[in-house]
C-alpha cells in the first residue's frame, strides 16, 4: 500500500523483535488467522489472532483522535519514538498525542504476541472459509 510508511511498519516490526528476539514478524505474523495482516473479519481463531484484532481496533480508535489525521487514513504513516531495553518497550514521553496513542497500540500488540501461542495451522488461512461472522 503506497500510503504505508516503511519506517513506521519497521518500527512495529522492531518492537515485536524486542519482545520476541528470535522472531521474523513479517514472515510469521502477516496473513495469520483472521486479523493478522490486511483487514479482518469474523471471530479470531486463537489468542494471537485476537491480539491482532485488538491492534486493529486500537488503530480504529486512533483514527478518531483529532490529532490523528493520517495520510490515506493509515496509522502506519505516523512514526513515533520508543526504546527497547531487554524485552521491555517504553513509548517516549516526547511523543505527541497521536504518536503516543499509536505507539501504545503497537506496544500492547507486541506484548500480546509474546504471550500468545503460535499455531502454524493458522498461517495463511482461507479467510473466506474460516473468518465468517
Amino acid at each position: 500500500d503506497s500510503g504505508i510508511s516503511p519506517r513506521a511498519v519497521w518500527q512495529f516490526r522492531k518492537m515485536i523483535k524486542c519482545v520476541i528476539p528470535g522472531s521474523d514478524p513479517f514472515l510469521e505474523y502477516n496473513n495469520y488467522g483472521c486479523y493478522c495482516g490486511l483487514g479482518g473479519s469474523g471471530t479470531p481463531v486463537d489468542e494471537l489472532d485476537k491480539c491482532c484484532q485488538t491492534h486493529d481496533n486500537c488503530y480504529d480508535q486512533a483514527k478518531k483522535l483529532d490529532s490523528c489525521k493520517f495520510l490515506l487514513d493509515n496509522p502506519y504513516t505516523h512514526t513515533y519514538s520508543y526504546s527497547c531495553s531487554g524485552s521491555a518497550i517504553t513509548c517516549s514521553s516526547k511523543n505527541k498525542e497521536c504518536e503516543a496513542f499509536i505507539c501504545n497500540c503497537d506496544r500492547n500488540a507486541a506484548i500480546c504476541f509474546s504471550k500468545a501461542p503460535y499455531n502454524k495451522a493458522h498461517k495463511n488461512l482461507d479467510t473466506k472459509k474460516y473468518c465468517q461472522s
Epitope: 469474523g42 471471530t43 479470531p44 481463531v45 486463537d46 489468542e47 489472532d49 485476537k50 499455531n119 495451522a121 493458522h122 473466506k128 472459509k129 474460516y130 473468518c131 465468517q132 461472522s133
Partner: antibody, heavy 116, light 106 residues
Amino acid sequence: EVKLQESGPELVKPGASVKISCKVSGYAFSSFWMNWVKQRPGKGLEWIGRIYPGDGDINYNGKFKGKATLTADKSSSTAYMQLSSLTSEDSAVYFCVRGWAWFPYWGQGTLVTVSA
Amino acid sequence: EIVLTQSPAITSASLGQRVTISCSATSSVSYVHWYQQKSGTSPKPWIYEISRLASGVPARFSGSGSGTSYSLTISTMEAEDAAIYYCQSWNFPLLSFGAGTKLELK
C-alpha cells in the same frame, strides 16, 4: 432472509439408519459452514460436526465419528445428516445451524425417535 | 477438547433481581458466546464474542470475562428472561457447549 428448513419427524427402529435434511434459502449455501447439533429430551446441546459445502470439508466431534455422516448438495442448497446403527440414545431433536465460530441461524429442529 | 462448565445448573430470581450465570473453560479460550432457549423452540443467539448483544436482545443483558472465566448478567430480571442459557466456545476448529443453566422466575 436466511431460512433453514428441516425435514419432518422420523420414527425409526433400533439398528436402522435415518437421513435428515436441511434446505436453506436467503444466502449463498456454498459459502457458509453448516453445523448439526443434538438435543436429547430435557438435556443440553451437543455439537455433532459441520460441513463446508463449498469444498466438502468436514469437522466432526470425535464422539459422533462413525455415528453421523454429513453431506451437502450444492445444486439444491440442502445439507444432510445420516445417523447409523440407531439406539435409544439417538432419540433427540437435531438442529441444522449456520455458522463457524458461533451460531446466528438455527433450523426448527427434526425430532428423531428410535423405538421398536 | 475444551469442556465448558456452567454454574449454577438451576437458579431462580425475583422480578427486578440481578442475575449472574457463569461459564468456566478447562483451558483459556478467546471467546465465549451465549444462547437462550425456551421450551419447545430452537436456541436463539443471545450474546456473542463475550459481550456483543445479538439483534433484539434487551440492554439489561451483558456479558464479560476472559481466559477461562466468563459470565452472563441480567441487571434486572424480567418474566420473559426465564429460560435455559447455554455458553459455547471453540478451540479451532472444534466447538463445545456448556450443559446449560435453567433460570426460573421466583
